[in-house]
Interface confidence: medium
């Protein structure tokens, strides 16, 4: 007799995972996060090395174990690219070599970036005469990819996405966001730790250089750096004022930039032409005053002028060198690494450093993603997944297009263009075939790189130089739209507005997101929702501004654009109303998280409708053992369990200002509150917490 319950080992495994994570004693209509994740929360403690911990993070941890296994074993048959990846990994885990060198590799590097005044004897005499702002800022940028004070980079021209163009933007800051520089309340400790971190590193360098140490001088100079960076932070635009790509795009010639944004640094007029040439000449590209440049931050550049006139060359160089040095400290000996402890604690809440092998596996993966991707897919990727996911993408794309018909706020003309764009989305699944099949191409990618196993620091510098030089060279090249925007060994998924491309790396094609062996309700609630999420990014508050070819072109009628903003506003208010206890009760930023929230809500709806279509076509699936839930309910449960997790308070404070995603619990609650299908599946009465009468819907 058939009781309609699946008893295969895969079904038992799925059921066990779902049961362990959930807390069935919680009422699902009161708090679905607690219902779906209560068991997980009870069973798990954030590791000392983690700033947040959840199912997503666990998948990343497990991927790192695979990377460790494939990187630590040299094999005679390894191709050169793989040998290099393994050499880089070995140099990174070689702690005895790193510790024996102290800070010496950094000390050797400092003269190349005009030194660090606070840690240099007679800085003015050594560097003062040759120092210019143009050279000093350009050197850090062109050689090491470190953008300070002015962020000049080569990127895709938003309005003509087959070409590259120089961009000028505001820089990133030493602290996670501009808000931290208030230095009061929840940010006080971070500011103190930041300045102490500077002082500690300066002290270590002076000790190693056998230079006298004056604590008051160190404190004075580093507090001045903080003062300067505070002013720069205040000059930067807030993220919520930078989310309209049309307003961000200001194309002008270098001559116009010189006119509009004249700066005076160290008593001398700043030459934008010289500065740009200092950078581009490193890749043999010559720039004239007629060169087109896209300025993303005109207000910042205007506010920068009065700031820079107030500070000396010494002050500016202290900040610039520090911003580079702070990135390198973790790659030096134990003493230097430990100088960062209090800073790390203040920003991330972690009391221990990530295990060396994990940090190294991630570092090598980030720098040699194709070589590592090859090792990863050979070790851990089931090739047949590719075709199943291809089919899922086709279904969800189809649902997205069908759903356009239901939208009352969008007119026919704009719907037609939206359909064209959805059909033009190019998908990338798993990994680029070439990384496994084309040895020569892979070897050529890393041809210029040669690593030494006892010189990790120099290997890092080599990588920085290589990747920056590669990026700058692109200025006179066409955009390669076939290039993948992510490596294969990544637990994530992506949408690129300039390429109109969605990517699902091999790393995300695993349970709970996907398995050819698990119930389809789980696949649709997992990877199905992720597919819908990425497709919807093409139509969120950012992506909607780009056309089917990836160009920043307005394809909306005025009425539809206005209605889109109105529909979106509902989510801005909804998510902005969530108060996060872990971040001291601060409210989420509904504007900064809007794109991700639109994508979550759209993606879930599309995946659910695709699953309904699947059932219509194939019939109901067998139930899972030990769970008194039907497959519609399992769809929502699996979606939610992807986001089971929690944060350290320090990192909650950090991510509420820096992460464009809502925290996991609010991704679950916000999305499901807007889903009538969810409330139907769990029989939630009207106006219960999970079923408010007012629901937001964009797509």
């Amino acid at each position: 007799y058939d009781d309609g319950i699946c008893k295969s080992s895969d079904c038992i495994k799925s059921a066990a995972r779902l049961i362990q994570n959930m807390d069935a004693t919680t009422e699902p209509c009161t708090d679905f996060f607690k219902y779906a994740c209560g068991g997980w929360l009870k069973r798990n403690v954030i590791p000392e090395t983690s700033s947040r911990y959840g199912n997503f993070d666990i998948l990343r941890d497990e991927l790192e174990v695979v990377l460790k296994d494939v990187l630590q074993e040299p094999k005679t048959e390894d191709i050169v690219a793989v040998q290099k990846a393994k050499a880089l990994y070995r140099s990174c885990i070689n702690e005895s070599a790193i510790d024996s060198r102290g800070g010496e590799p950094l000390l050797k590097l400092l003269p190349d970036i005009y030194g660090w005044p606070v840690a240099t004897e007679n800085w003015e005499q050594k560097y003062g005469a040759s120092w210019t702002a143009e050279k000093a800022i350009a050197q850090l940028n062109s050689k090491y990819g470190k953008k300070v004070l002015i962020n000049l980079f080569v990127g895709t021209d938003d309005k003509n996405s087959v070409n590259h163009v120089i961009h000028i933007d505001q820089p990133r800051l030493g602290l996670p966001s501009r808000d931290y520089y208030e230095c009061t309340g929840i940010y006080k400790e971070a500011c103190t730790a930041y300045v102490d971190f500077m002082i500690s590193v300066a002290r270590l360098i002076r000790q190693e250089e056998r230079l006298p140490i004056d604590e008051n001088q160190l404190a004075l100079e580093m507090n001045k750096v903080m003062e300067l960076e505070k002013e720069i932070a205040n000059a930067t635009a807030k993220p919520e004022d930078r989310n309209d790509p049309m307003l961000l795009y200001n194309k002008m010639t270098l001559a116009q930039i010189q006119n509009n944004f004249s700066l005076e640094i160290n008593g001398k007029p700043f030459s934008w032409l010289n500065f740009t040439n200092e950078i581009m000449s490193t890749v043999n590209i010559s720039i004239t005053n007629e060169e087109d440049v896209v300025v993303y931050a005109p207000e910042y550049l205007t506010k920068l002028k009065p700031i820079l006139t107030k500070y000396s060359a010494r002050d500016l160089q202290n900040l610039m060198s520090w911003r580079f040095i702070m990135d390198l400290v973790s790659s030096l000996s134990r003493t230097y690494k430990e100088s960062r402890n209090a800073f790390r604690k203040a920003l991330y809440g972690t009391t221990s450093e990530t295990a060396t092998w994990r940090r190294c596996a991630n570092y090598v993966n980030g720098n040699m993603e194709n070589a590592v991707g090859r090792l990863y897919v050979e070790a851990a990727f089931a090739g047949e997944s590719k075709h199943v996911v291809e089919d899922l993408i086709a279904q969800i794309r189809e649902v997205f297009i069908q759903t356009l018909d239901d939208l009352t706020w969008m007119d026919a003309e704009t719907k037609k263009r939206a359909e064209e764009k959805a059909l033009a989305i190019k998908e990338r699944i798993g990994y680029p075939d070439d990384i496994v099949s084309n040895d020569n191409k892979l070897n050529n990618e890393y041809l210029e790189l040669n690593y030494k196993e006892d010189e990790y620091f120099e290997n890092i510098i080599q990588n920085l130089k290589f990747s920056q030089s590669k990026q700058l060279k692109k200025l006179r090249e066409k955009v390669d739209k076939d290039e993948w925007i992510s490596g294969a060994a990544v637990v994530n998924a992506f949408y690129s507005s300039g390429r109109n491309q969605i990517v699902f790396p091999a790393g995300i094609l695993q349970p709970p997101f996907f398995s050819a062996q698990q119930s389809n309700s789980l696949n649709y609630g997992g990877i199905g929702m992720v597919i819908g999420h990425e497709i919807t990014h093409g139509f969120d508050d950012n992506g909607r501004n780009f056309n089917k070819d990836g160009d920043l072109v307005d394809w909306w009628t005025q009425q539809s654009a206005s209605n889109f903003k109105e529909q979106s506003q509902c989510m801005v208010y909804q998510y902005g109303n969530f108060s996060w206890d872990l971040a001291g009760g601060q409210h989420l930023n509904g504007i900064n998280t809007l794109g991700e929230n639109i994508a979550d809500n759209g993606g879930l709806g599309q995946a659910y409708r695709a699953y309904q279509n699947y059932i219509k076509k194939n019939g109901e699936e067998k139930l899972l053992p030990g769970l008194d839930l039907n497959h519609k309910q399992l769809f929502f449960l699996n979606f939610a369990q992807v986001w089971c997790g929690t944060y350290r308070p320090e990192y909650a404070v950090n991510s509420i200002k820096t992460d464009v995603h809502s925290p996991g619990n609010f991704r679950i609650i916000g999305t499901l509150q807007n889903s009538a299908e969810f409330s139907e599946a769990f029989h939630c009465r009207k106006n219960s917490y999970m079923n408010p009468e007012k629901k937001c819907r964009v797509w």
């Epitope: 004056d214 604590e215 004075l220």
Partner: nanobody, 130 residues
Framework: QVQLQESGGGLVQPGGSLRLSCAAS????????MYWVRQAPGKGLEWVSA???????YYTDSVKGRFTISRDNARNTMYLQMDNLKSEDTGVYYC????????????????????????WGQGTQVTVSS
């Protein structure tokens, strides 16, 4: 190498004045905090005053309002103008740089050791006596 040379000491009556100088060489004078430290006969080292690179000044409580520290970066020289001198101001006055401890600790600690500073002058004798 770093050299600090004090001058200007001497014998003075209570209520009188002296101006000490500290000539510096071998380093970028304008980039460093500078300090005056004294040692009374048979006593330990005591911090007197400090001046930072921007000309802000700091004093131990017993000399506030009587002593004035200043610097002339163009001449690589630091000064200590001592007015209304008292007998307890008698001692050897040293100029120093590269403090290993913060002013707050110099104040609270009272007594210093030679290792609290990286560089010292050879000192100049100040005697306040009638």
């Amino acid at each position: 190498q770093v050299q600090l040379q004090e001058s200007g000491g001497g014998l003075v009556q209570p209520g009188g004045s002296l101006r000490l100088s500290c000539a510096a060489s071998g380093f970028t004078f304008s980039s460093y905090w500078m300090y005056w430290v004294r040692q009374a006969p048979g006593k330990g080292l005591e911090w007197v005053s400090a001046i930072n690179t921007e000309g802000n000044t700091y004093y131990t409580d017993s000399v506030k309002g009587r002593f004035t520290i200043s610097r002339d970066n163009a001449r690589n020289t630091m000064y200590l103008q001592m007015d209304n001198l008292k007998s307890e101001d008698t001692g050897v006055y040293y100029c120093a740089k590269d403090a290993k401890i913060l002013i707050a600790r110099m104040r609270s600690q009272g007594r210093l050791s030679r290792s609290d500073f990286g560089s010292w002058g050879q000192g100049t004798q100040v005697t306040v006596s009638s």
